[in-house]
Amino acid sequence: SITGISPITESLASLSTYNDQSITFALEDESYEIYVEDLKKDKKKDKVLLSYYESQHPSSESGDGVDGKMLMVTLSPTKDFWLQANNKEHSVELHKCEKPLPDQAFFVLHNRSFNCVSFECKTDPGVFIGVKDNHLALIKVDYSENLGSENILFKLSEILEHHHHHH
């Protein structure tokens, strides 16, 4: 279970792929679309509010003991909207929702080589946010394989201003 209901920390950052393409969010027909694209030099990167939560990680060796903590994150590019995993459609979508957020909005954070991170679905272990055909999608990764596959690697560039939502 997630410890407490408030995040341990928050940060405002832009999100890009391993290949330095930007993740952007556009309002179309009253719903948000998520794009993966090369940004024109003068275009500002979209900001995402990342809220980090700690969850107790149960120990399988010591029965009901606790090994440590799982670091989970929610991603919100604009007020009241959060990235969510749609496991049935293998898609990543932006949904308006109220707190408490559904489990589909939580992703286990992994840090990887090259100062990249990966986002694993809380609701579907082994499934990560990835890039497919210039969109974000859910990609199944075999744990025995190298999790460094580039399409699930993302870079976070923190924006040094107070962690308020932008509008």
């Epitope: 341990i8 920390t9 940060s11 980090y52 700690e54 990680h57 120990s59 399988s60 060796e61 010591s62 090994d67 440590g68 903590k69 799982m70 670091l71 286990v108 954070l109 992994h110 840090n111 990887r112 080589s113 100062n115 694993e120 744990y143 025995s144 394989e145 190298n146 999790l147 460094g148 923190e158 040094l160």
Partner: antibody
Framework: EVQLVESGGGLVQPGGSLRLSCAAS????????MSWVRQAPGKGLEWVSS????????NYADSVKGRFTISRDNSKNTLFLEMNSLRAEDTAVYYC???????????????WGQGTLVTVSS | DIQMTQSPSSVSASVGDRVTITCRAS??????LAWYQQKPGKAPKLLIY???SLQSGVPSRFSGSGSGTYFTLTISSLQPEDFATYYC?????????FGGGTKVEIK
């Protein structure tokens, strides 16, 4: 109870090799990022290398890149550090450390071994 | 690489004193900072993670604060067992880096 026990340290000549091991118990070893941190005599702490739970992702300090290799055997709950082309400046106590966070080093290291001394000298 | 600068390098204090140690990062690290205590001949012990979260089993007289580039560790009332060396560590990006340490000595 979480335990990390390092072994494999000793005296080695410059240019030589050593393989350090860290035997882990008391936690789900394969779930955690593991790291090596070293401390030269009378000096501060220096991070050396980290490896993800499944071994698929590794990171190294520039000072050891190309000379040291981190690996793990999850079936034996053991972490390794293969050290080649050793230099006098590699002389230090080497600690094996478990990340507090399962899949990330963002939360620091909550358990450390007792350390094993590596001395590089002719 | 992110440089971590700790100050002071040493401090002399008495039991019951309030002690504050600062750590500056050469660039922003959000809240990804840990504090450790190390006693001679022993391994470091995690005190604080994510800048201000108290690690399980650590006495509440230890507290951490800060974000971005400036962080502090405070011991509200120094106890005999607190005389040790304290290190900050940025956990924001590789290579992970430690401050140079602050030795808390008996006055």
């Amino acid at each position: 109870e979480v335990q990390l026990v390092e072994s494999g340290g000793g005296l080695v000549q410059p240019g030589g090799s050593l393989r350090l091991s860290c035997a882990a118990s008391g936690f789900t070893f394969s779930s955690y990022v593991m790291s090596w941190v070293r401390q030269a005599p009378g000096k501060g702490l220096e991070w050396v290398s980290s490896i993800s739970g499944n071994g698929g992702s590794t990171n190294y300090a520039d000072s050891v890149k190309g000379r040291f290799t981190i690996s793990r055997d999850n079936s034996k709950n053991t972490l390794f550090l293969e050290m080649n082309s050793l230099r006098a400046e590699d002389t230090a106590v080497y600690y094996c450390a478990k990340s507090l966070g399962t899949t990330t080093t963002f939360l620091g290291f909550d358990y450390w071994g007792q350390g094993t001394l590596v001395t590089v000298s002719s | 690489d992110i440089q971590m600068t700790q100050s002071p390098s040493s401090v002399s204090a008495s039991v019951g004193d309030r002690v504050t140690i600062t750590c500056r990062a050469s660039q922003g690290i959000s809240s990804w900072l840990a504090w450790y205590q190390q006693k001679p001949g022993k391994a470091p012990k995690l005190l604080i993670y994510a800048a201000s979260s108290l690690q399980s089993g650590v006495p509440s007289r230890f507290s951490g604060s800060g974000s971005g580039t400036y962080f502090t560790l405070t011991i509200s009332s120094l106890q005999p067992e607190d005389f040790a060396t304290y290190y900050c560590q940025q956990a924001n990006s590789f290579p992970l880096t430690f401050g140079g340490g602050t030795k808390v000595e008996i006055k």
